[in-house]
């Protein structure tokens, strides 16, 4: 839970307050909104970032439905409850005692209920499909060059191991990045695919969460790759539970 001692900032999360009050006078950074100490050598969890971002505009995330089990986030931003490790609590409630269950990326996966609603476990989002449309270019990007560049980006910028980048699909102008990470595959210290996808989403919108690093400058063989829209699909290890009423 430390950052650079020299200027005491958090390289991986600008939405923090840092001071040299850690052990031995080391820099310690706490997330805005929650006050939770964060590890500045890796990505901060999406729950803590959302909590810190409550002053940001609504509808920051748009979701679509790739199949019958995919989730649509119609609820916009909310002030989440995070557990001591910074993960979303399985049950989220608003100030009017309306409650619902969420998955590991904080998207609602049940109908809304009251305080009696039970959410037994935090269901893991194990498959994320990032759907991008790039701005027109002189010609199509070479698929293998694009694949390599995106895998490099997720490795070097978000510290996500390439084994979790299942595939990169390309049909100009649409790029799809598939991230897969089952509970059994995620070892201690591994970046969560949900956190990597969230950082990437903010980066392509020009809202980088990194401190001091430049914004995202994606290039494929020197040609700029400029994203004009992003859609993210989330699939959970256990399908969501919505009533038929919601589906009509």
């Amino acid at each position: 839970h430390t950052a650079a001692q020299d200027n005491c900032t958090c390289p991986t999360n600008k939405m923090t307050v840092c001071s040299p009050d850690g052990p031995g006078g080391r820099c310690q950074c706490r997330a805005l909104g929650s006050g939770v100490a964060v590890d500045c050598s890796t990505l901060t969890s999406e729950c803590l970032l959302l909590k810190a971002r409550m002053s940001a505009p609504k509808n920051a995330r748009t979701l679509v439905r790739p199949n019958e089990h995919a989730l649509v986030d119609n609820d916009g931003l909310y002030d989440p409850d995070c557990d001591p490790e910074g993960r979303f609590k399985a049950r989220q409630c608003n100030q009017t005692s309306v409650c619902w269950c969420v998955n590991s990326v904080g998207v609602r996966r049940t109908d809304k209920g009251d305080l009696s609603l039970r959410c037994d476990e935090l269901v893991r989002t194990h498959h994320i499909l990032i759907d991008l449309r790039h701005r027109p270019t002189a010609g199509a990007f070479n698929h293998s060059d694009l694949d390599a560049e995106l895998r490099r980006l997720f490795r070097e910028r978000y510290r996500l191991h390439p084994k979790f980048v299942a595939a990169v699909h390309y049909e100009q102008p649409t790029i799809q990045i598939e991230l897969r990470q089952n509970t059994s595959q995620k070892a201690a210290g591994d970046v969560d695919i949900g956190d990597a996808a969230y950082y990437f989403e903010r980066d392509v919108k020009g809202e980088s969460l990194f401190q001091g690093r430049g914004g995202l400058d994606l290039r494929v063989r020197g040609e700029p790759l400029q994203v004009e829209r992003t859609l993210i699909y989330y699939l959970d290890e256990i399908p969501p539970k919505f009533s038929m009423k919601r589906l009509t």
Partner: antibody, heavy 119, light 108 residues
Framework: QVQLQESGPGLVKPSGTLSLTCAVS?????????WSWVRQPPGKGLEWIGE???????SYNPSLKSRVTISVDKSKNQFSLKLNSVTAADTAMYYC????????????WGQGTLVTVSS | DIQMTQSPSTLSASVGDRVTITCRAS??????LAWYQQKPGKAPKLLIY???SLESGVPSRFSGSGSGTEFTLTISSLQPDDFATYYC??????????FGQGTRLEIK
């Protein structure tokens, strides 16, 4: 026990191409590790050259990038280094190593092979 | 690129001494730092990764600490087998991998 073994010519002429191969045993080259080359000029420190992942993703030291190619041969469980346009400054002990983690630290090393660039 | 600077360049010590080697990064690298031991004519050997995690099979007299820009390798009680050259290496995600210039630990 993971073992790495470098092989290749010990003498290369200036402006020529240095070619080395690293045979891996005790681990599959298709495992989720990185396969790196590191060099050490006589009496000097260590310099990372570059690395490859089994899928073909490569990462190179920017100072050498224009001259380096690292490739992988999954069928032979080995990976290779090519460094072209060599000069006397490329004379060094060349090590292959297995990189662990998302960005590599090196948990297994070959014993090294000395390459001299001289006419 | 991130520069890694080790100090001292040479260290003279006796068996049983407690010794500390310092490694400084030119910018914050979190805890993405490894330490290696190298003996003449041999390949480097991993001692510590992620600043303070001891590699399997490495004696517990070796320990690492630090984060951000300043790191230390400590040998709590020097053994005859420990006289060697020690290197630090950063593996931060936004920079090519770089090593320190080395610290030679010699018998006093």
């Amino acid at each position: 026990q993971v073992q790495l073994q470098e092989s290749g010519p010990g003498l290369v002429k200036p402006s020529g191409t240095l070619s080395l191969t690293c045979a891996v045993s005790g681990d599959s080259i298709s495992s989720h590790n990185w396969w790196s080359w590191v060099r050490q000029p006589p009496g000097k420190g260590l310099e990372w050259i570059g690395e490859i992942y089994h899928s073909g993703i490569t990462s190179y030291n920017p100072s050498l990038k224009s001259r380096v190619t690292i490739s992988v041969d999954k069928s032979k469980n080995q990976f290779s280094l090519k460094l072209n346009s060599v000069t006397a400054a490329d004379t060094a002990m060349y090590y292959c190593a297995r990189g662990s983690g998302v960005i590599s630290y090196f948990d297994y090393w070959g014993q090294g092979t000395l390459v001299t660039v001289s006419s | 690129d991130i520069q890694m600077t080790q100090s001292p360049s040479t260290l003279s010590a006796s068996v049983g001494d407690r010794v500390t080697i310092t490694c400084r990064a030119s910018q914050s690298i979190g805890n993405w730092l490894a330490w290696y031991q190298q003996k003449p004519g041999k390949a480097p050997k991993l001692l510590i990764y992620k600043a303070s995690s001891l590699e399997s099979g490495v004696p517990s007299r070796f320990s690492g600490s630090g984060s951000g820009t300043e790191f230390t390798l400590t040998i709590s009680s020097l053994q005859p087998d420990d006289f060697a050259t020690y290197y630090c290496q950063q593996y931060d995600s936004y920079s090519p991998i770089t090593f320190g210039q080395g610290t030679r630990l010699e018998i006093k």
